[in-house]
Interface confidence: medium
C-alpha cells in the first residue's frame, strides 16, 4: 500500500493546487519559463526554471519549498541539463504540469 507523502511534499502539492485553483489574472503577468524534463531531478530542475521569475508573490512560497527539496544551491540563470532545449511555457502551465507530474508519482503503486 502506498504511503502518503512527507509533510513537506504534501504542502508543496497543496500549494500547487492552491495556485492552479485560485488563479484569476494571468499568473506572474504571463511570464515565460523554461520547460523541463519531468523524468528525473524534478525539484532542482523546477527550481532552476522558476527562480528566474522575480517579483511574483504567487509563486514565492513554491520557490521556497522547491529550494528545500533541492540539495544544491540554485541561482538565477543556471542552466539545467533537464531543461527542454529552447522551449518556454507560461508559469501557469509550468505549475500545472508540475502538479500533474507529482500527482502521477503518488498514484503509481496505488492504481493498477
Amino acid at each position: 500500500s502506498p504511503v502518503p507523502p512527507s509533510t513537506a511534499l504534501k504542502e508543496l502539492i497543496e500549494e500547487l493546487v492552491n495556485i492552479t485553483q485560485n488563479q484569476k489574472a494571468p499568473l506572474c503577468n504571463g511570464s515565460m519559463v523554461w520547460s523541463i524534463n519531468l523524468t528525473a531531478g524534478v525539484y532542482c530542475a523546477a527550481l532552476e526554471s522558476l527562480i528566474n521569475v522575480s517579483g511574483c508573490s504567487a509563486i514565492e512560497k513554491t520557490q521556497r519549498m522547491l529550494n528545500g527539496f533541492c540539495p544544491h544551491k540554485v541561482s538565477a540563470g543556471q542552466f539545467s541539463s533537464l531543461r527542454v532545449r529552447d522551449t518556454k511555457i507560461e508559469v501557469a502551465q509550468f505549475v500545472k504540469d508540475l502538479l500533474v507530474h507529482l500527482k502521477k508519482l503518488f498514484r503509481e503503486g496505488q492504481f493498477n
Partner: antibody, heavy 119, light 107 residues
Framework: QVQLVQSGADVKKPGASVKVSCKAS????????IHWVRQAPGQGLEWMGA????????AYNQKFKGRVTMTTDTSTSTAYMELRSLRSDDTAVYYC????????????WGQGTLVTVSS | EIVLTQSPATLSLSPGERATLSCRAS??????LHWYQQKPGQAPRLLIY???QSISGIPARFSGSGSGTDFTLTISSLEPEDFAVYYC?????????FGGGTKVEIK
C-alpha cells in the same frame, strides 16, 4: 459548481449485476480520482474502491475484488461502478465521491443510488 | 487494514452543550484523518480534513484535533441542525476505512 449526479434507484434479483453511473460537472474530470462508497440500511460507510480517470487505473477493496469493475468515460465525464453476482447483503445506497489524491478527503459526494437486491 | 474505532456509539446531549467525539486508529496515521457529518437520507458532508483543517462554509463551532492514533471532533455548542451521525475516515493507506460512526442525538 461541482456536482456529482448519480443514476436512479434500481431493484435487482440475486445473482444479477448492477451498473451505477456518476456524472461529474463543475471541474476538470481527469484531475480527480473517483471513489465509490456504499452504505447498507442503518449501517456505516464502506469504501469499495477507486479509479483514476486519467489512466483508467483502479484500486479495489479486497472484499469486492472479482465482483466489482470501475470505469470512466472521459468524453462525458462519467464514472461507472458495476457490481456482479449480487446478494441480498449488497442492498445499500452507493455513493460516488471525488478525491484529488487518495490521502485527501472526499470533498464532494453524489446524492447516492439505492440498489435493492431481492428475489 | 487500518481499523478506526469511534466512541461513544451514541451521544445524548441538549442544544447548547459541548460534544466531544473520539476516533482511535489501530496504527499511526499521522494527520491523515477526515471527519464527515451525515443526516438521514443525505450523503455525508466533509467537516474537517487532515485531523484539524477547517472547511470553508462549515461553522466555526466544529473543530478537530489529534495526530497519530487518537483524534477528536469537538462541537463547541450544539445547534439543532448538528444532531446527526459523524464518521471519521482513514486517508493514510488502502483500503480507505471509516469508523463505525457516532450518533449525536437530542437528550
Amino acid at each position: 459548481q461541482v456536482q456529482l449526479v448519480q443514476s436512479g434507484a434500481d431493484v435487482k434479483k440475486p445473482g444479477a449485476s448492477v451498473k451505477v453511473s456518476c456524472k461529474a460537472s463543475g471541474y476538470t474530470f481527469i484531475d480527480y480520482e473517483i471513489h465509490w462508497v456504499r452504505q447498507a440500511p442503518g449501517q456505516g460507510l464502506e469504501w469499495m474502491g477507486a479509479i483514476d480517470p486519467e489512466t483508467g487505473g483502479t484500486a479495489y477493496n479486497q472484499k469486492f475484488k472479482g465482483r466489482v469493475t470501475m470505469t470512466t468515460d472521459t468524453s462525458t465525464s462519467t464514472a461507472y461502478m458495476e457490481l456482479r453476482s449480487l446478494r441480498s447483503d449488497d442492498t445499500a445506497v452507493y455513493y460516488c465521491t471525488r478525491i484529488l489524491l487518495y490521502y485527501y478527503p472526499m470533498d464532494y459526494w453524489g446524492q447516492g443510488t439505492l440498489v435493492t437486491v431481492s428475489s | 487494514e487500518i481499523v478506526l474505532t469511534q466512541s461513544p456509539a451514541t451521544l445524548s446531549l441538549s442544544p447548547g452543550e459541548r460534544a466531544t467525539l473520539s476516533c482511535r486508529a489501530s496504527q499511526n496515521i499521522s494527520d491523515y484523518l477526515h471527519w464527515y457529518q451525515q443526516k438521514p437520507g443525505q450523503a455525508p458532508r466533509l467537516l474537517i480534513y487532515y485531523a484539524s483543517q477547517s472547511i470553508s462554509g462549515i461553522p466555526a463551532r466544529f473543530s478537530g484535533s489529534g495526530s497519530g492514533t487518537d483524534f477528536t471532533l469537538t462541537i463547541s455548542s450544539l445547534e439543532p441542525e448538528d444532531f446527526a451521525v459523524y464518521y471519521c475516515q482513514n486517508g493514510h493507506s488502502f483500503p480507505l476505512t471509516f469508523g463505525g460512526g457516532t450518533k449525536v442525538e437530542i437528550k
